[in-house]
Amino acid sequence: ASGSASGSASTLVHNGTSARATTTPASKSTPFSIPSHHSDTPTTLASHSTKTDASSTHHSSVPPLTSSNHSTSPQLSTGVSFFFLSFHISNLQFNSSLEDPSTDYYQELQRDISEMFLQIYKQGGFLGLSNIKFRPG
Amino acid sequence: SVVVQLTLAFREGTINVHDVETQFNQYKTEAASRYNLTISDVSVSDVPFPFSAQSHHHHHH
């Protein structure tokens, strides 16, 4: 967690409609998809895995939007607009779980927010979201 | 409450700050119902490019 007592996730969740998805044999096609040209760089990818049934698990990887190294500039530098968005969730209480990306509470909230934005902006030129951070209100 | 901060990426020229905020506000009710998230105090701003996750980490509005 950062000095501002927040949890952070720096991955781009892609809009599945804007990129061709590659899947592993165990996976199904999901909106949390990754363009095929990223598939050879598994070490830089964050994995989103959701248990669905005893016989199958959803897996998909999402590429990082940015690197934490200042000198590396994203490949998306041309033809892309970025917007910083913040909002309060008034019916949730901040607790230490939201400082730790490995907790169920963190992952559930991140998943819900990611899915929500993928749906709200699925019309038009939405490419994805990244750098989700949680902090006390 | 919990404050959520994130970055949205769009193809250039397809949307502006005002429309990002308007569209999000339009679905706050659905968000409350579908995801049990009661959303308020929405703020949207342009992000100057280039930027990185680290440099943006303490950007609070």
Epitope: P31, F32, T50, H58, R111 | Y27, T29, A32
Partner: antibody
Framework: QIQLQQSGPELVKPGASVKISCKAS????????INWVKQRPGQGLEYIGW????????KFNEKFKGKATLTVDTSSRTAFMQLSSLTFEDSAVYFC???????????????WGQGTSVTVSS | QILLTQSPAIMSASPGERVTITCSAS?????IHWFQQKPGTSPKLWIY???NLASGVPPRFSGSGSGTSFSLTVSRMEAEDAATYYC?????????FGGGTKLEIK
């Protein structure tokens, strides 16, 4: 045409578990949410929760957390609900119903399965 | 969670009669849906977003309301309209249903 076909009736003992299925056809399974609704004999409708087949994400009515588990198998276009530690109060007809993501959420649950009767009896 | 109260619980109407069923919410909601259910069958979406008729619903049905007060009206009752009608809100999680109104034909 669009259909949700549910599995057949179940007679189970108290304390056991049961898994019922809902097979979708006639639309893109991963595009729509699947909701589950409970109806006890002669009673009204009670919302259990939803699952989004596109991601496997789900959310429950607090009352059914720990009682119901929602899963999907996208290869067979089937949603499942498992009910555990069954009691007599779990005897009911359980329906699956599809609905829409944003921005079409306000269309409501437009197609329903025929229902699966679960009877808990010793 | 939001409580939906339907009234009346049971009512009878003669063919051709005008019928109104009400649904009252414990807190303000954006819109409601109405479902029709006949014995031994699954519910059918009947009216969505307060006032829009679902596919195949006869035009003698209508829906209206806002805030905490909503209604379903049948302009001229017919035998096939005999069923139980449920209202549902989805403005607040979890979605909730009204207790139902059983509409009978005289």
């Amino acid at each position: 045409q669009i259909q949700l076909q549910q599995s057949g009736p179940e007679l189970v003992k108290p304390g056991a578990s049961v898994k019922i299925s809902c097979k979708a056809s006639g639309y893109t399974f991963t595009d729509n949410y699947i909701n589950w609704v409970k109806q006890r004999p002669g009673q009204g409708l009670e919302y259990i929760g939803w699952i989004y087949p596109g991601s496997g994400n789900n959310k429950f009515n607090e009352k059914f957390k720990g009682k119901a588990t929602l899963t999907v198998d996208t290869s067979s276009r089937t949603a499942f609900m498992q009910l555990s530690s069954l009691t007599f109060e779990d005897s009911a007809v359980y329906f699956c119903a599809r609905d829409y993501p944003f921005p079409s959420y306000h269309y409501g649950m437009d197609y329903w399965g025929q229902g699966t009767s679960v009877t808990v009896s010793s | 969670q939001i409580l939906l109260t339907q009234s009346p619980a049971i009512m009878s109407a003669s063919p051709g009669e005008r019928v109104t069923i009400t649904c009252s919410a414990s807190s303000s909601v954006s819109y409601i849906h109405w479902f029709q259910q006949k014995p031994g069958t699954s519910p059918k979406l009947w009216i969505y977003s307060t006032s829009n008729l679902a596919s195949g619903v006869p035009p003698r049905f209508s829906g209206s309301g806002s805030g905490t007060s909503f209604s379903l009206t049948v302009s001229r009752m017919e035998a096939e309209d005999a069923a139980t009608y449920y209202c549902q809100q989805r403005s607040s999680y979890p979605p909730t249903f009204g207790g139902g109104t059983k509409l009978e034909i005289k």
